[in-house]
């Protein structure tokens, strides 16, 4: 015999108190699959969490973090402090990327600049704390007499010594 509850679609629940008829999920609750005997309570995005997507009868609310923070975890269960581009979050807080590394996002770690010479290329644009170097054509690609691209010396920013 087929379970009568299996006919209840998402957004409803199988109401045992009403001869197993399909009742709509009450306000602030949802069921994302059919055949459910209860609806789940909607997540509320409070405090540092803000609503990215409202709850509907068939899907839970989705949260993200207030400006200055970014999500961690499945479904944004925690918020972590942003840093600026050119920084990484360390145990001492946000710190500038060391010389020779960069971070172009407000989260994550500083990564080494691309080593253009490994690909036989030259440096077209120097790297910064916020941006990777841009590699140019390999010296062999430059025909004799063509304007050569001289790899500039790595520009050290004032007060930003190697660490």
């Amino acid at each position: 015999l087929q379970d009568p509850c299996s006919n209840c679609p998402a957004g409803t629940f199988c109401d045992n108190n009403r001869n197993q008829i399909c009742s709509p999920c009450p306000p602030n609750s949802f069921s994302s699959a059919g055949g459910q005997r209860t609806c789940d309570i909607c997540r509320q995005c409070k405090g540092v969490f803000r609503t990215r997507k409202e709850c509907s009868s068939t899907s839970n609310a989705e949260c993200d973090c207030t400006p200055g923070f970014h999500c961690l975890g499945a479904g944004c269960s925690m918020c972590e402090q942003d840093c600026k581009q050119g920084q990484e979050l360390t145990k001492k807080g946000c710190k500038d990327c060391c010389f020779g590394t960069f971070n172009d996002q407000k989260r994550g770690i500083c990564r080494p600049w691309t080593n253009c010479s490994l690909d036989g290329k030259s440096v077209l644009v120097n790297g910064t704390k916020e941006r990777d170097v841009v590699c140019g054509p390999s010296p062999a690609d430059l025909s004799p007499g063509a304007s050569s691209v001289t790899p500039p010396a790595p520009a050290r920013e004032p007060g930003h010594s190697p660490q």
Partner: antibody
Framework: QVQLVQSGAEVVKPGASVKLSCKAS????????MHWIRQAPGQGLGWIGA????????DYNQKFKDRATLTADTSISTAYMELSRLRSDDTAVYYC?????????WGQGTLVTVSS | DIQMTQSPSSLSASVGDRVTITCRAS??????LNWYQQKPGGAVKLLIY???RLHSGVPSRFSGSGSGTDYTLTISSLQPEDFATYFC?????????FGGGTKLEIR
């Protein structure tokens, strides 16, 4: 820097109420939920409840639902916890703490002693 | 409610020792696990959040790992200031719940 400063120690009689305060500084008070946690002498940590200062919305541990009331005054960046019908086993240190999905900053705690 | 079982409840160790504290949840908490340190004076500090992320200012001798229901706090080389009580806490569901604590004492 971010700081939570709690009110001073209280000695109260059984059956009475106590209202504790937690003053926040160094961040936007309304932007973070405030949670309250207690620790009885020699015991572990127990969650009482939380308040969203922006909306006044609260969540309570069922154990405290009938006796705890959480409020917040955003104009002075202060959260409050009132506990009524006090019993001797409510003797504990009460902490407020800011929530990011983890409790990153804690108040210094307020000792409440329930004694006749 | 999600139960958090922490072990051992107390532990004697010496400066320089490697120490491991474990925490088991009664259901999958999807890495939503945090660790706190409480000194005898009562002050509570966050050490690690989201299983393994070190909070600002916490020395790198502290580390966390785990998934599902089983989680671990490790102190790689104990320092005199590490003798304290440690608590785990889950943020997967309300009510937030804590482990019973591990008191780390000097041998």
């Amino acid at each position: 820097q971010v700081q939570l400063v709690q009110s001073g120690a209280e000695v109260v009689k059984p059956g009475a109420s106590v209202k504790l305060s937690c003053k926040a500084s160094g961040y936007t008070f309304a932007g973070f939920e405030m949670h309250w946690i207690r620790q009885a002498p020699g015991q572990g940590l127990g969650w009482i409840g939380a308040i969203d200062p922006k909306t006044g919305g609260t969540d309570y541990n069922q154990k405290f639902k009938d006796r705890a009331t959480l409020t917040a005054d955003t104009s002075i960046s202060t959260a409050y916890m009132e506990l009524s019908r006090l019993r001797s086993d409510d003797t504990a240190v009460y902490y407020c703490t800011r929530d990011l999905g983890y409790f990153d900053v804690w108040g210094q705690g307020t000792l409440v002693t329930v004694s006749s | 409610d999600i139960q958090m079982t922490q072990s051992p409840s107390s532990l004697s160790a010496s400066v320089g020792d490697r120490v491991t504290i474990t925490c088991r949840a009664s259901q999958d908490i999807r890495s939503n696990l945090n660790w706190y340190q409480q000194k005898p004076g009562g002050a509570v500090k966050l050490l690690i959040y989201y299983t393994s992320r070190l909070h600002s200012g916490v020395p790198s001798r502290f580390s966390g790992s785990g998934s599902g229901t089983d989680y671990t706090l490790t102190i790689s080389s104990l320092q005199p200031e590490d003798f304290a009580t440690y608590f785990c806490q889950q943020s997967e569901k309300l009510p937030r719940t804590f482990g019973g604590g591990t008191k780390l004492e000097i041998r």
